[in-house]
Interface confidence: medium
């Protein structure tokens, strides 16, 4: 779970260790603040749960890629 003790900066201190199906994901945001101990991705699921994930893991990259390409269809 993301931690917003030092609001408005939200940080991740632990990452999920299980892969989440892209069908369960609604959106994501990147955490790159220097105030946080590590770079992270926070996925929001279709039931509005927020999950911290490691952006260096390929399933995380693939999920972000999938979400991006749902919203950014190349021009034809």
């Amino acid at each position: 779970q993301p931690d917003a003790i030092n609001a408005p900066v939200t940080c991740c201190y632990n990452f999920t260790n299980r892969k989440i199906s892209v069908q369960r994901l609604a959106s994501y945001r990147r955490i790159t603040s220097s105030k946080c101990p590590k770079e992270a991705v926070i996925f929001k699921t279709i039931v509005a749960k927020e999950i911290c994930a490691d952006p260096k893991q390929k399933w995380v990259q693939d999920s972000m890629d999938h979400l991006d390409k749902q919203t950014q269809t190349p021009k034809t």
């Epitope: 260096k56 990259q61 972000m64 190349p74 021009k75």
Partner: antibody
């Protein structure tokens, strides 16, 4: 820290094959994609392909399809790129790189492959 | 393949100069581009990826901008260690492609 160490320089005859290795440390290769990029002398960078070491799925630039084989051994954290039917135009420095999406944040030191009769 | 056209192919500049390198994609790449620096005999080094993300340890004098098909790398005040060749790369779709490079030389 992440380190990618490649095998040494090779001199090959036209028509032969070359196999370049890339040993990773400081990362679990099954959690990432490993890519190969080459650079001919005085030229730019050219992406060749990548492997998902977890399931051995590969993706290639169509221009190399059928001539390049990318493999990985997760037990030794090593990726391999084999290029067959070598010609003089394949003379280049070959780099392995750790992929994030499709950009490359860690690179091997490069392996020079010279194709000459 | 998405072609990436980089310009200029070379430029001469002095220490302290502001340097701008441009890259044009032949279709929208939705900010999926990276910039690399390469010095002779060395592997490329990642500088910037995505919209504006500076890689860890890269000096803040490097910045990236642009959208759609047009992207720019700016070095706000050129330092002696910045003389090198710079490449853009698109990672919107495979095969991932690079620009032809820009060699930044000492004037």
């Amino acid at each position: 820290q992440v380190q990618l160490v490649q095998s040494g320089a090779e001199v090959k005859k036209p028509g032969s094959s070359v196999k370049v290795s890339c040993k990773a440390s400081g990362l679990t290769i099954s959690h990432t994609y490993m890519h190969w990029v080459r650079q001919a002398p005085g030229q730019g960078l050219e992406w060749m392909g990548r492997i998902d070491p977890d399931n051995h799925n590969t993706k290639f630039d169509p221009k190399f399809q059928g001539r390049v084989t990318i493999t990985a051994d997760t037990s030794t954290s090593t990726a391999y790129m084999e290029l067959s039917s070598l010609r003089s135009e394949d003379t280049a420095v070959y780099y392995c790189a750790r992929g994030v999406f499709g950009f490359f944040d860690h690179w091997g030191q490069g392996t020079t492959v010279t194709v000459s009769s | 393949d998405i072609q990436m056209t980089q310009s200029p192919s070379s430029l001469s500049a002095s220490v302290g100069d502001r340097v701008t390198i441009t890259c044009k994609a032949f279709e929208d790449i939705y900010n999926r581009r990276a910039w690399y620096q390469q010095k002779p005999g060395k592997a490329p080094k990642l500088l910037i990826h995505g919209a504006t993300s500076l890689e860890h340890g890269v000096p803040s004098r490097f910045s990236g901008s642009g959208s759609g098909t047009d992207y720019t790398l700016t070095i706000s005040s050129l330092q002696p260690e910045d003389f090198a060749t710079y490449y853009c790369q698109q990672f919107w779709s495979a095969p991932y492609t690079f620009g032809g490079g820009t060699k930044v030389e000492i004037k």
